[in-house]
């Protein structure tokens, strides 16, 4: 029978930079059972805080509500691990709200097959942020990137739609099923999971166009930019 | 409605022992840093002590230290503060005050009073 | 442990006049200072937080400014309802110290 061993804090999350969880990893047991404390002080403060909601975030979590959350604030937090034996102390993390932002996926992906008359089809795809982020008051830029792949297939295909929220592909496999997805960053941050998979079956007529694919500006009526393969490589983000 | 109720304050000799309560009603108590704050008549406010959400860090005011005792009970939704070796000076409205994310006292009760006299 | 002075300790003003009450802390606490309105016979009620951050609800004739060791509470127009005495508390460490109050009065 031992101390327990040190924890270390692996993670720390924000969906919107209004509220915030991080996660800690206990160390060994030292055969006794442990209790586990997180306790934080912002930069600038020396009153120490113990965690105010160990529930919300799961197991080995410490949530801080909006009322503990403070922008421009640098947290400083460590986890306390306590059995009869002792106790062991995690290293301090450092935790400044701005730069832990992972944004829910965005919503409402809508897919379409547009085959217009005088122009070549494609495939065109819309979605929203998510609800959590409020886009008006400035605070966030969010990037945008979607992958699409045919059902069967192994690889995925990624394009970095910048800011946009619409997107338009020329260069598909006429017949396939396939399956496409959206995710979203903010400037600093973290990327979103991604979206749930929307299907969308390509009419076995599709032309196709493999040299070029079409990014579209806000509005699809508006101005049009042609993208090369070159080009559209350069703005991959993994 | 968010609610602070302090209970417990009285006449009692120099030398003598009371016990504050204060409960709190409308908001998660167990989520919140809790503290002490006196007012002796026709005087200023002065914090005497601070105690954290689960009760595991808690500070004093020197004037109390050694005398007076912060204490938690989240599961009865209640602050108490266990108040020995009185004196003259100990004479005052006890409030007592929610601590707020940001570290400041958002919520305050009405206030108990203490007074100490022979 | 760090000092709070506020001054005036009190003051008498007419109704519309700017009304400003100063805090000084013995040492730095950066902008961790807030500012509290006691009308008499009544409860603290926080007024504004982080030096400058209203609180929510309060006239927005309140203000606040300063950082470091020199810190201003300002009314920007004198009301009635602002007969009060008025403290300063640092939050950064403890102990959570207040400045001595200013009474503030109608002339």
């Known amino acids: 029978q031992l101390p327990p061993g040190k924890p270390e804090i692996f993670k720390c999350r924000s969906p919107n930079k209004e509220t915030f969880t991080c996660w800690w990893r206990p160390g060994t047991d030292g055969g006794l059972p442990t209790n586990y404390s997180l306790t934080y002080h912002r930069e600038g403060e020396t009153l120490m805080h113990e965690c105010p909601d160990y529930i919300t975030g799961g197991p080995n979590s410490c949530h801080f509500g909006k009322q503990y959350t403070s922008m421009w604030r640098t947290y400083v937090m460590m986890v306390n691990a306590t059995n009869q034996m002792g106790s062991s102390f995690s290293d301090e993390l450092y935790v400044d709200v701005t730069y832990i932002v992972q944004p829910d996926p965005p919503l409402e992906l809508t897919v379409e097959v547009k085959q217009p008359e005088d122009r070549k089809p494609y495939l065109w795809m819309k979605w929203s942020p998510p609800t959590l982020i409020d886009l008006k008051t400035g605070w966030f830029t969010l990037l945008y990137e979607i992958r699409l792949k045919p059902e069967k297939a192994a690889e995925w295909e990624t394009h970095f739609a910048g800011q946009q929220t619409e997107f338009k592909i020329l260069s598909l496999h006429p017949g396939q099923k396939y399956l496409v997805q959206v995710r979203c960053k903010p400037d600093h941050g973290y990327w979103s999971a991604w979206s749930p998979a929307t299907f969308i079956q390509i009419p076995s007529d599709f032309i196709m166009n493999d040299e070029q694919k079409l990014i579209s500006e806000e509005d699809l009526g508006g101005e049009q930019k042609l993208i090369s393969e070159e080009d559209l490589h350069h703005h991959h983000h993994h | 409605e968010v609610q602070l109720v302090e209970s417990g304050g009285g006449l009692v000799q120099p030398g003598g022992s009371l016990r504050l309560s204060c409960a709190a009603s409308g908001f998660t108590f167990s989520s919140y840093e809790m503290n002490w704050v006196r007012q002796a008549p026709g005087k200023g406010l002065e914090w005497i002590s601070y105690i954290s959400s689960r009760g595991g860090t808690i500070y004093y005011a020197d004037s109390i230290k050694g005398r007076f005792t912060i204490y938690r009970d989240n599961a009865r939704n209640s602050l108490y503060l266990q108040m020995n070796s009185l004196r003259a000076e100990d004479t005052a409205i006890y409030y007592c005050?929610?601590?707020?994310?940001?570290?400041?006292?958002?919520?305050w009760g009405q206030g108990t009073m203490v007074t100490v006299s022979s | 442990d760090i000092q709070m002075t506020q001054s005036p300790s009190s003051l008498s003003a007419s109704v519309g006049d700017r009304v400003t009450i100063t805090c000084r802390a013995s040492?730095?606490?950066?902008?961790?200072l807030a500012w509290y309105q006691q009308k008499p016979g009544k409860v603290p009620k926080l007024l504004i937080y982080?030096?400058?951050t209203l609180q929510s609800g309060v006239p927005s004739r309140f203000s606040g400014g300063g950082s470091g060791t020199d810190f201003t509470l300002t009314i920007s127009s004198l009301q009635p309802e602002d007969v009060a005495t008025y403290y300063c508390q640092r939050y950064n460490s403890a102990p959570l110290t207040f400045g001595g109050g200013t009474k503030v009065e109608i002339k």
């Open positions: 040492q730095g606490i950066s902008n961790y």
């Open positions: 982080f030096a400058s």
């Open positions: 005050a929610r601590l707020s994310g940001v570290d400041i006292f958002d919520i």
